[in-house]
């Protein structure tokens, strides 16, 4: 008669994929069809894989996702011409562990962080065999890095300065497939190297050839002498200049620039050690020519008393305002209405209070420090009758 061999009475498995094995001997050797596995709920499973040696048949079953409710008595069954044999065995399905809390950041420097991994309490089953601390920079397309940890307090080294990182903990229990899902994520930012940049930086055009950079007063925390280093470079040309400004000043005039050119400026506070650069600021010097006409002009949503006009403007011409001028078709030039939009970032305006059933001539032009653009063509606008929906 067949005989089931090497099957322990009790098996502990981790939830997830599970491949139980039934091994049997006997003559003739049991075939694929003659070996089954019966779950506690009575479901009969057939081998997904099968092989045999001279003395044994080995049936491999596949359960894609075994869960705690599947715990209980399973039965390996072999039924051949020589007879039938069954062997019950107990399976205990465990829940993979996952920390309930995110790790805590105790301390950070410019290249390290001290972390309390907060691995307990956790959801799921123990005992915990090992713990991993996973980390990666935010906004980087890098894979998670990890370190194995034994203590609750761990130091992460070799981090980048002034970089935001994400942290989480992964717990591993004994047995195959014992890696739990990573727990909640904590974000933190490493410190800067050197002094922080000046606060309240502001860059504004002063003239066609100058830009003015201002910042809040700097109060050093040590006795060391310090100065502000300002770097300016042209976006259009490969032209860069670094200027040293005494630490007691709160502004610098960047001169000898070119009209209608965009510059990028940044600043830092240096002592013996160099400080950390500020974010880039950009500004255009004032224009030396009239601005071009607004482009992409579109009049839409026309009703009996209103219409929406939209447009775009080109960067770099120091455009300070947009004027929409409209008048009834055929009326004198001086009988027009001017709408001045002083915020040049606005690109849409609703003309209101128009007369129904009236033809208007609409012009739109841009103004800068030199003057106004010259519209080549007027736009026609005919309001609808009050009864007519747009």
């Amino acid at each position: 008669t067949p005989k089931i061999v090497d099957l322990p009475d009790h098996i502990e498995v981790n939830s997830g994929k599970f491949n139980p094995i039934c091994k049997a001997s006997g003559w003739p050797l049991p075939t694929n069809e003659e070996m089954t596995l019966v779950k506690p709920d009575g479901t009969v499973l057939h081998p997904k894989d099968f092989n045999h040696t001279d003395h044994f048949s080995v049936a491999i079953f596949t359960i894609h996702r075994i869960l705690p409710p599947d715990s209980g008595v399973w039965v390996c069954s072999v039924n051949t011409v020589a007879g039938m044999v069954e062997k019950p065995f107990n399976i205990s399905v465990k829940v993979l562990p996952k920390p309930l809390n995110a790790p805590n950041v105790i301390d950070t420097g410019h290249n390290f962080a001290v972390i309390n991994i907060s691995s307990e309490p956790y959801f799921g089953d123990g005992p915990i065999k090992s713990k991993k601390l996973l980390y990666k920079p935010v906004n980087h397309y890098e894979a998670w890095q990890h370190i194995q940890v034994t203590n609750e307090i761990v130091t992460l080294n070799y981090l980048e300065p002034r970089t935001e990182y994400e942290l989480c903990v992964q717990l591993v229990r004994r047995g195959e497939g014992g890696e739990g899902h990573p727990g909640p994520v904590r974000r933190f930012t490493t410190a800067s190297i050197g002094l922080p940049p000046p606060r309240g930086l502001n860059l504004l055009p002063k003239s066609q050839t100058t830009l003015n950079l201002t910042w809040q007063p700097i109060f050093p925390s040590s006795e060391d002498d310090f100065y502000v280093e300002v770097e300016r470079r042209s976006v259009q040309k490969s032209d860069q200049q670094n200027i040293k400004v005494p630490g007691n000043l709160t502004s610098v005039l960047l001169n000898n620039l070119h009209p209608r050119e965009q510059y990028v400026v940044r600043a830092r506070v240096n002592t013996k050690a160099q400080g950390e650069w500020s974010e880039d600021l950009t500004a255009w010097t004032l224009s030396d020519i009239l601005p071009p006409q607004p482009e992409n002009i579109k009049i839409s949503n026309i009703t009996h008393s209103s219409a929406v006009i939209s447009w775009t403007i080109l960067d770099g011409y120091s455009i300070s305002s947009i004027t929409i001028r409209y008048k009834v078709q055929g009326k004198n030039e001086d009988q027009h209405v001017d709408v001045k939009i002083k915020n040049a970032t606005i690109t849409q305006y609703q003309l209101k209070g128009l007369e129904p059933e009236t033809a208007y001539q609409v012009d739109i032009f841009a103004e800068n420090n030199i003057g106004s653009s010259n519209p080549a063509f007027s736009h026609e606008l005919v309001t609808l009758p009050e009864s007519q929906a747009p």
Epitope: Q293, E295, N296, I297, K298, I299, H304, W311, T312, Q329, P356, E357, T358, A359, A376, F377, H379, E380, V382, T383, L384, P385, S387, Q388, A389
Partner: antibody, heavy 115, light 107 residues
Framework: QVQLQQPGADLVRPGASVKLSCKAS????????MNWVKQRPGQGLEWIGM????????RLNQKFKDKATLTVDKSSSTAYMQLSSPTSEDSAVYYC????????WGQGTTLTVSS | DIQMTQSPSSLSASLGERVSLTCRAS??????LNWLQQEPDGTIKRLIY???NLDSGVPKRFSGSRSGSDYSLTISSLESEDFVDYYC?????????FGGGTKLEIK
């Protein structure tokens, strides 16, 4: 001065889609709607649709929604109308016209659909 | 869609004569109406927009007017180049629609 240049004629086989062009000059192409109008031989005018080159917003006559596709190429200031699966019913003169109020018209392209 | 009924469909007149063409709108279109001229070679030109506004370069003998839902194009004194086709066009409501056209012929 404003000009809308259209090829004088085009011949297409039935079922083979055709793309008509309208090259604009003398004004800011991206600031005015462009209309397309159909005229069958000896008949009146029929509006197909319009497109605004700034953002390619398109408004189509429901009658032509499965027939006409309007596009623009801002770099060459050219408007296009593609007609799908043309039949003899699509043989006509096709005009482009500038602006929401049809202020300037192209010379028209005579499209002949014939095998 | 708004229907534009244009009359007459053809009209014979003499040089120097005063003529009027009419379009009637099936719904209220306010002043949202143009008059177009089409020459025998197919060239189309806008003569009048918004019912009564003369386009630049268009002779003063052309004028547009409105009475209720009836819109008129008047040519005060016909000249030889005026004997072509005329269409009205409404754009108050989408889709814009055209009148059936008037063929102006020399008597």
């Amino acid at each position: 001065q404003v000009q809308l240049q259209q090829p004088g004629a085009d011949l297409v086989r039935p079922g083979a889609s055709v793309k008509l062009s309208c090259k604009a000059s003398g004004y800011s192409f991206t600031s005015y709607w462009m209309n397309w109008v159909k005229q069958r031989p000896g008949q009146g005018l029929e509006w197909i649709g319009m497109i605004h080159p700034s953002d390619s917003e398109t408004r189509l006559n429901q009658k032509f929604k499965d027939k006409a596709t309007l596009t623009v190429d801002k770099s060459s200031s050219t408007a296009y109308m593609q007609l799908s699966s043309p039949t003899s019913e699509d043989s006509a003169v096709y005009y482009c016209a500038k602006g929401y109020y049809f202020g300037y018209w192209g010379q028209g392209t005579t499209l002949t659909v014939s095998s | 869609d708004i229907q534009m009924t244009q009359s007459p469909s053809s009209l014979s007149a003499s040089l120097g004569e005063r003529v009027s063409l009419t379009c009637r709108a099936s719904q209220d279109i306010g002043i949202s109406l143009n008059w177009l001229q089409q020459e025998p070679d197919g060239t189309i030109k806008r003569l009048i927009y918004a019912t009564s506004n003369l386009d630049s370069g268009v002779p003063k003998r052309f004028s547009g007017s409105r009475s209720g839902s009836d819109y008129s194009l008047t040519i005060s004194s016909l000249e030889s180049e005026d004997f072509v086709d005329y269409y009205c066009l409404q754009y108050a409501s989408s889709p814009p629609t055209f009148g059936g056209g008037t063929k102006l012929e020399i008597k």
